[in-house]
Structure formats: C-alpha cells, structure tokens
C-alpha cells in the first residue's frame, strides 16, 4: 500500500536570466527511493538513479545542474521554461510518486515589481 | 476503473479527414495526465500521434503535424482526433490513450479499424 | 526521432523456459524505456517502464534491465498465455518511439 505524499514547492516564480531549484520531498513512507525522474510533459530533463548516478538530458546540459540533493536547479531561465515540471519518485516496494511544480517565469523588471508586494 | 473506448466510421475516402472521438469513463480528462492518440498499421508498427493535456495544450508527431488536430469535449468527457488529407497510407487501428509522466502509457482504449479507400 | 530497433522480429520458446528480448535506442535514453505486450485481437498492455520498474499488477516473471541505449526485456518461466508481441518504447523524449515488435512463439 503506498501511504507515502510528496510535497513541492508548488507554485514558484523567477525572474528571466535567473536560477531556480525544483526541489520535491517524499514523506510519510519507509520505502526506499531508487530512482527520481524530473520530467516536463513531453520530455525528460533528468534522472537521478541510485545506481548509475545522475543523467542529464542534452537539450538541458548547459543550463540545468543535479542537486540539491534529489532536486534540480534550472539556470538561465527563459520565458519559454514557463511551464509544469514533474519529479518522479521510483520506490521500492511502494511504486511510483509523482509531485507537481508550476513554474512561472517573468520578466525582470516584472518579478521585481511583483516582489514588493508579497506579503512576508 | 478508467476505461477509453474509440468510435468513428470505419471507412474513410482517401483525401477526406478522418475524425475519432474517444469516450473516457471513470475519470475527468481535465483531472491530470495526457491524452494520447496512437496507431498500429497493418503489421503492427506503432506510431504516436499527439496528445492533449488535461489543462488543454496539445503537442504533436512532427510527421503529421500539418494534418492533425487533437480537441476535448470536457462537459462530455471527450478527446477527438481530427486527420485531414488521408490516404490509403493512413489505414490503421487508432487507439485512445492515456500517459502518465515517467510510466507510459498505461491505459489504452480497445482500438478501432480505420480504412482508407475510395 | 529516436528510434527504437528490436532486431527480432520473432522468437521461439518453450513453456517454463527463459527467454530474453532485446530494443536498442539511436541515441541514450538513461532509463526512459517501457515495455509493453499484444495479445492477439487485444490493445498493448504496459508491463515494464523506467527499464525496470514493474507496473501495477504485473507478474514478477516479467523482468527488465538496461541504460543508455541497450535494453533487455525477459520472461522467466515462460506460461502458455505469453503468447504475444512485446514492444520497447522510449519515453525520453516526443515524438514518443516503439520498436517494430517481437513476437513470442511458444513450441
């Protein structure tokens, strides 16, 4: 029975040109975590396997590092990485978790302007 | 249970378009997931057509990007598959499909036989 | 594209043998690979994704294995009822690609 939840950051924001970090967490659950797919809808950014290590995709290499930890930090950030971003929990012996990030990514000048009015 | 079930003609005249509606039960196809249209030609080679996201994007195979058109009915629980320009090299199964992001595609509709000729 | 080549288009095999299919990818696909059967008059099953992962349901007889770009699908203990066509398919990247096929004849 999977009785695990993973959480998320959720909804996030970041200014073009910037970095973010996709960062998942899996809780409430002893199973082990073999492999962590990061996924957009119709393509794989990267996979962390315990075995093999870290993959990243080639249309990602340049601007996309393994880490913290499980997560995965996007550089660069262009308008067109707005968008939904997936990471996949492989578990043994529960099966498979899948976590959900909105990321929006603003124009400079907007992100600043957005900034000043969040509330704390 | 999810279940997907395909209906349209069974016959289709070469450079009409063939139109396909996929019937989901058990599931609300604006929920989560992409909903996927694929075909087995006569022997059995699959190809992946496109799909449409629950939130409403579609992406499709490049090599029928100038001819396909994936829509919803979401107060029916619809997709459709639209092919224009057909010929006898489109003559297929066409299964509705459902993908989960890291899996595949886990759920598929029975299929249905679509032949083009005049 | 990617393609995805199953460089047997059929294999024979005895029930309670092992049997193994093969699917190699045009370029690496780190784990991205599924594996799914056809029964005759039937729409493909998914059995196996991330190149090993047995999805819901499945029988612990069916295995998979691979990274990069060489892939492995096997049957231990093959049963009367493994009569099918198995086929990889990459989910990597779309276009999302299969392979030709492999159909499993039992003796």
């Known amino acids: 029975m999977m009785t695990g939840t993973i959480e998320t950051t959720g909804n996030i924001s970041a200014e073009k040109g910037g970095s973010i970090i996709l960062q998942c967490h899996l809780s409430s659950t002893t199973a082990q975590v073999t492999q962590v797919n990061w996924e957009q809808q119709d393509q794989l950014l990267a996979i962390c396997n315990a075995d093999l290590g870290w993959h990243i995709s080639p249309s990602f290499k340049d601007r996309v590092a393994p880490g913290p930890g499980l997560g995965l930090t996007l550089q660069s950030l262009t308008v067109n990485d707005t968008g939904e971003y997936f990471c996949i929990y492989h578990t043994y012996p529960d099966g498979t978790y899948t976590g959900r990030i909105f990321l929006e990514v603003l124009e400079s000048s907007v992100a600043e302007h957005g900034a000043r009015f969040q509330i704390p | 249970d999810v279940q997907l079930q395909e209906s349209g003609p069974g016959l289709v005249k070469p450079s009409q378009s063939l139109s396909l509606t996929c019937t989901v039960t058990?599931?609300?196809?604006?929920?989560?997931?992409?909903w996927n249209w694929i075909r087995q030609f006569p022997g059995n080679k699959l190809e992946w057509m496109g799909y449409?996201?629950?939130?409403?994007?579609?992406n499709y195979n490049p090599s029928l990007k100038s001819r396909i058109s994936i829509t919803r009915d979401t107060s029916k629980n619809h997709f459709f598959l639209q092919l224009n320009s057909v010929t006898a090299e489109d003559t297929a199964t066409y299964y509705c499909?459902?993908?989960?992001?890291?899996?595949?595609?886990?759920?598929w509709g029975q299929g249905t036989l679509v032949t083009v000729s005049a | 594209d990617i393609v995805m080549t199953q460089s047997h288009k059929f294999m024979s095999t005895s029930v309670g043998d092992r049997v193994s299919i093969t699917c190699k990818a045009s370029?690496?696909?780190?784990?991205?690979v599924a594996w799914y059967q056809q029964k005759p008059g039937q729409s493909p099953k998914l059995l196996i994704y991330?190149?090993?992962y047995r999805y819901t349901g499945v029988p612990d007889r069916f295995t998979g294995s691979g990274s990069g770009t060489d892939f492995t699908f096997t049957i231990n203990s093959v049963q009367a009822e493994d009569l099918a066509v198995y086929y990889c398919?990459?989910?990597?990247?779309?276009?999302?690609?299969f392979g030709g096929g492999t159909k499993l004849e039992i003796k």
């Open positions: 370029q690496d696909v780190s784990t991205a």
């Open positions: 991330s190149a090993s």
């Open positions: 398919q990459q989910h990597y990247s779309s276009p999302w690609t």
């Open positions: 499909a459902r993908r989960q992001v890291g899996l595949g595609f886990a759920y």
């Open positions: 449409i996201v629950y939130s409403g994007s579609t």
């Open positions: 058990g599931y609300s196809i604006t929920s989560d997931y992409a």
